[in-house]
Amino acid sequence: VPRWRQQWSGPGTTKRFPETVLARCVKYTEIHPEMRHVDCQSVWDAFKGAFISKHPCNITEEDYQPLMKLGTQTVPCNKILLWSRIKDLAHQFTQVQRDMFTLEDTLLGYLADDLTWCGEFNTSKINYQSCPDWRKDCSNNPVSVFWKTVSRRFAEAACDVVHVMLNGSRSKIFDKNSTFGSVEVHNLQPEKVQTLEAWVIHGGREDSRDLCQDPTIKELESIISKRNIQFSCKNIYRPDKFLQCVKNPEDSSCTSEI
């Protein structure tokens, strides 16, 4: 008789999840010499240990500590690029500007990017049918707790000027409920970070508005200023040209507004 299984509102664990995590770990450690010492089997064991046999609505940051320890990585703390609701452009940017890093350019972020996972209480099975949805089921689920944990650590490591890419096409350019708004903003360390520099990415080709004056950006400025960190904001009117100029900075058109 098949065992009764909890039905959650979200999609189940990504198929071939263990193989995917292990393969990504091997690939990452081959490409990044400073992480060659990492034992990927141990990384997978620690990842698995964080959620297997545990109730998927009762996961804590503590559960991920063994994984965090194995994935400890040093990136230049003044080269951090945060992003909110504009992941693809942020990743395209760091692929060209190789000395800057998003969370997904680190080992732990790379392992989990775009994946879903959860287990079941008291069984060693991975649940491929459904996993808890953050809104409809519970916030302390394996995926949400993982991203909260790694995002907090990433923000805590930042120094000098921290950059954030924001989506100017959204109704809330800065969203207090995003990972950036709810976790990263509050974990920047004022004794290390002097400025948060926001890049607001425009969507429309003819959009010449100053989105740095948007009420949600003013709200971000207020939150950041109260934390004793300076705030600056820059419109990126032409994201296509912006990327082109990062690739070819000698182009004469790259000194004008982008």
């Epitope: 000027v161 950059h163 820059k234």
Partner: nanobody, 121 residues
């Protein structure tokens, strides 16, 4: 590659001001720029930095409020305005590009040759 050439150093009275310039050629887009200094018998130390695209600035505590870093992208030039100078500001000042910081260690990918600033009392 990035080439950097400083100018503007010299002898100045305590309490006076001086503006250093750094001409930049080569790859300049999205590269943190900054100024370091090295006093006789001391290590080279960070003074001020600026993000090349957004223009956000950051400073060592010892020079906050006295030094101002700025840049002109159209002229590919970096500046350091130094006010209320003290004899202890005497040093060789270096322009740097591609600033990196790991913990408290600050480095850079590219360096200029340096320009001497001497503050007399």
């Amino acid at each position: 590659q990035v080439q950097l050439q400083e100018s503007g150093g010299g002898l100045v009275q305590a309490g006076g001001s001086v503006r250093l310039s750094c001409a930049i050629s080569g790859r300049t887009f999205i590269n943190d720029m900054g100024w370091f200094r090295q006093a006789p018998g001391k290590e080279r130390e960070f003074q001020a930095g600026i993000t090349w695209f957004g223009g956000s600035t950051y400073y060592a505590d010892s020079v906050k409020g006295r030094f101002t870093i700025s840049r002109d992208n159209t002229k590919n030039t970096l500046y350091l305005q130094m006010n209320s100078l003290k004899p202890e500001d005497t040093a060789i000042y270096y322009c740097a590009a591609g600033l990196k910081r790991i913990g408290d260690q600050r480095e850079a990918d590219y360096w200029g040759q340096g320009t001497q600033v001497t503050v007399s009392s």
